[in-house]
Interface confidence: medium
């Protein structure tokens, strides 16, 4: 893959170390994007599009910031709704959310993942759940994204304002991974309800995506190397 579209293609090219790599959306040189690739988790090939780990980056931001992205891809960041939409428009992607609290880890994966375009308010589309964290994201299925200055939820109140984040809020959330770091007050922190409830802020979270067929392709490559 001379111009990899995602981290899975980098991995197929032999780039086995996790780190920052350029990807080229739809294989076009003009659409270059620097992303963090997780090459080790569950077969690797993941584009990490969100990470929370120390509270150094403010995630209570406006629509414009969430559209284009913010932060440092080697630390805490949000890749940007436009980028997430463009990546997931390349084909079928799957989603994985990794969470850690000290030595305790949990994950949630969904066999489909896409985010619609700006005209459709970046609505979330996910498939079937698998994992150890419990399914807290399906509640948000089909919801548009909301920020403090773009209230697209179905609540009377402004969910983003109430819970100091930005998310695919409904009324309001089962999970709020862009909530306030370290905040244990009810529903205000980084929550995944079915794992740790709404009164615990998860210290480490990564959201990541990769082509759904990566496992199959990686398996074929391994087989071909054996002959």
């Amino acid at each position: 893959f001379p111009h990899p579209q995602d981290c899975a293609q980098h991995l197929m090219n032999g780039d086995t170390l996790s780190g920052v790599y350029p990807i080229f959306l739809n294989g076009e040189l003009s659409q270059k994007l620097q992303v963090y690739c997780d090459m080790t988790t569950d077969g690797g090939g993941w584009i990490v599009f969100q990470r929370r780990q120390n509270g150094q980056t403010d995630f209570f931001r406006k629509w414009a910031d969430y559209r284009v992205g913010f932060g440092n891809v080697e630390d805490e960041f949000w890749l940007g709704l436009d980028n997430i939409h463009r990546i997931t428009s390349q084909g079928r992607y799957e989603l994985r959310v990794d969470m850690r609290d000290g030595q305790e880890a949990a994950f949630a994966s969904y066999d489909r993942f896409s985010v619609e375009d700006s005209r459709n308010l970046y609505k979330l589309r996910i498939g079937s759940y698998n994992g150890t964290a419990g399914d807290s994201l399906s509640y948000h299925q089909g919801r548009p994204f909301s920020t403090e200055d773009r209230d697209n939820d179905v609540a009377v109140t402004n969910c983003a304002m109430s819970y100091k984040g930005a998310w695919w809020y409904k009324n309001c959330h089962r999970t709020n991974l862009n909530g306030k770091y370290g905040e244990s007050r009810h529903s205000q922190g980084i929550n995944w309800y079915h794992w740790k409830g709404h009164e615990f802020s998860i210290p480490f979270v990564e959201m990541k995506m990769r082509p759904y067929n990566h496992r199959l392709m990686a398996g074929r490559k391994r087989q071909s190397l054996q002959f």
């Epitope: 079937s128 759940y129 698998n130 399914d135 399906s138 509640y139 299925q141 179905v154 609540a155 009377v156 109140t157 409904k170 009324n171 309001c172 959330h173 009810h186 529903s187 309800y193 709404h198």
Partner: antibody, heavy 120, light 107 residues
Framework: QVQLVESGGGLVQPGRSLRLSCAAS????????MHWVRQAPGKGLEWVSG????????YYADSVKGRFTISRDNAKNSLYLQMNSLRAEDTALYYC?????????????WGQGTMVTVSS | DIQMTQSPASLPTPVGDRVTITCRAS??????LNWYQQKPGKAPKLLIY???NLETGVPSRFSGSGSGTDFTLTISSLQPEDFATYYC?????????FGQGTKVDIK
């Protein structure tokens, strides 16, 4: 149109078993969680059990845990409730209800119910 | 389990009057609250979901409000077909629990 039809109710002795069925039509069955909710004669509503759209996750009220088993056959658009070790307090009208989501949330469509009477 | 407490239990009301039913959750539930209407011999019917959203086909005289622990169902002008029992239900966590019901009958 969306429809839920329950069956399998009847008169049963304490300690015996009964299996309720719910036939669904008019919607993509496996996209939605499904539930059983009961109502004892002259009383309020009590959620009994729920199951996710895929069937991978099941949920029970404490009052029936270990005695009742919820299941679904997505190929047949059917929901089931296997009720074992029945007690007099299980006597109720049992409703099958569709959720608005793939995980337990809100019941937007209800069947007309099937009556279960536990008595010696 | 989350306890849901409805009041009043019974509400005799003349046609045309405004009706207010309250529901209190024993713990914070954001806006995860639904209201159902049940007429004698019939299955419950969803009226309002997520505290304030009117289900399709439900008349606009019904409205819901509240968040956190305190919620209200309001019927702006009671019609003869509105005489029924109303239940609140929390969908915040399983087991999903219902209030004990409020019977609205003719005064």
């Amino acid at each position: 149109q969306v429809q839920l039809v329950e069956s399998g109710g009847g008169l049963v002795q304490p300690g015996r078993s009964l299996r309720l069925s719910c036939a669904a039509s008019g919607f993509t069955f496996d996209d939605y969680a499904m539930h059983w909710v009961r109502q004892a004669p002259g009383k309020g509503l009590e959620w009994v059990s729920g199951i996710s759209g895929s069937g991978g996750s099941t949920y029970y009220a404490d009052s029936v845990k270990g005695r009742f088993t919820i299941s679904r056959d997505n190929a047949k658009n059917s929901l089931y409730l296997q009720m074992n070790s029945l007690r007099a307090e299980d006597t109720a009208l049992y409703y099958c209800a569709k959720d608005i989501s793939a995980v337990p949330d809100t019941f937007d469509i209800w069947g007309q119910g099937t009556m279960v009477t536990v008595s010696s | 389990d989350i306890q849901m407490t409805q009041s009043p239990a019974s509400l005799p009301t003349p046609v045309g009057d405004r009706v207010t039913i309250t529901c209190r959750a024993s713990q914070y539930i954001q806006g995860f609250l639904n209201w159902y209407q049940q007429k004698p011999g019939k299955a419950p019917k969803l009226l309002i979901y997520d505290a304030s959203n009117l289900e399709t086909g439900v008349p606009s005289r019904f409205s819901g409000s509240g968040s956190g622990t305190d919620f209200t169902l309001t019927i702006s002008s009671l019609q003869p077909e509105d005489f029924a029992t109303y239940y609140c239900q929390q969908s915040y966590s399983t087991p999903q629990t219902f209030g004990q019901g409020t019977k609205v009958d003719i005064k």
